[in-house]
């Protein structure tokens, strides 16, 4: 399956925080989305192979890495001034 953690996270002002996303489905592609109240999902970053990733529609204030196939952590950087949202990780073949 696919596992995202933590379930809840509080960020101190000026801090970077990292959200974990791990999958054991042997999927090549992984995605991070953000959902704000009353809105649809918006793509932050996506990755289609190891060590390659592309910006989505709202990449500003976020960073990612794809060091291995199974993992695609998202860092919410201190530059992200409005981080409060629901974050969703997904994967696909």
């Amino acid at each position: 399956g696919i596992t995202q953690s933590p379930k809840y996270l509080f960020r101190k002002e000026g801090q970077n925080v990292t959200l974990s996303c791990e999958q054991n489905l042997n999927h090549d592609a992984m995605y991070w989305y953000r959902q704000d109240p009353g809105q649809g999902l918006r793509l932050i970053y996506y990755s289609q192979i190891v060590n390659d990733f592309q910006k989505g529609d709202i990449a500003e204030g976020y960073s990612v890495s794809r060091e291995k196939k199974e993992s695609f952590p998202l860092t919410v950087t201190s530059a992200q001034k409005n981080p409060t949202a629901f974050y969703l990780c997904a994967s696909s073949i």
Epitope: Q48, I49, V50, N51, D52, S65, K68
Partner: antibody
């Protein structure tokens, strides 16, 4: 910052096995990425030989597949190249290399290179 | 294997010149994920190659803006807009879309 350093004999006799080791510092080879061997012939042509992945899986150049083995020693954070049945055509500078983050498979962390001469 | 053919194989130019090196692959370098893994390296004598451009047109960290890459499919170019003394070196294209990864034969850029 990832640093790589090749080591091994500079002279190998024809028909013998070439053995080189790459020591990695600044990053664990089990944490991610692909750990490559690339060689450069005296005429300056570059050839990708193969890699070992963070999970221990291999991908080899088919032109070398019957002769090449890339393995790793995770306790020493090293990966190694063995090339059997060498001839003078295997004389080259051998580099270990790994990709820079986010570049696909484009390598930009390189060892200094070690010159291997095949001669009796 | 994918053959990578660079032209010219050598080139003489002067400081300030605009220089273009071309690289042609024997088949398309578009990956099934729609990215194109074509890269450019610079090598100086006694040194390992250095990454200049990755994925056709992305300048690697610290690479001056006078270097640019373009192209698609099978035809690619590296352009140096205004040659500097430190740019005289050998340039290689490389593809990592298909295994085995392959390199062009190199273009040696010399001072005129």
């Amino acid at each position: 910052q990832v640093q790589l350093q090749e080591s091994g004999p500079g002279l190998v006799k024809p028909s013998e096995t070439l053995s080189l080791t790459c020591t990695v510092s600044g990053y664990s080879i089990t944490s991610g990425y692909f750990w490559n061997w690339i060689r450069q012939f005296p005429g300056k042509g570059l050839e990708w030989m193969g890699y070992i992945s963070y999970d221990g899986s291999n991908n080899y150049n088919p032109s070398l597949k019957s002769r090449i083995t890339i393995s790793r020693d995770t306790s020493k954070n090293q990966f190694s190249l063995k090339l059997s049945s060498v001839t003078a055509a295997d004389t080259a500078v051998y580099y270990c290399a790994s990709p820079s983050p986010g570049t696909g498979y484009a390598v930009d962390y390189w060892g200094c290179g070690t010159t291997v001469t095949v001669s009796s | 294997d994918i053959q990578m053919t660079q032209s010219p194989s050598s080139l003489s130019a002067s400081v300030g010149d605009r220089v273009t090196i071309t690289c042609r692959s024997s088949q398309s370098l578009v990956h099934s994920n729609r990215n194109t893994y074509l890269h450019w390296y610079q090598q100086k004598p006694g040194c390992a190659p250095k990454l200049l451009i990755y994925k056709v047109s992305n300048r690697f960290s610290g690479v001056p803006s006078r270097f640019s890459g373009s192209g698609s499919g099978t035809d690619f170019t590296l352009t140096i807009s205004s040659l500097q003394p430190e740019d005289f070196a050998t340039y290689y294209c490389s593809q990592s879309t298909h295994v085995p990864f392959t390199f062009g034969q190199g273009t040696k850029l010399e001072i005129k």
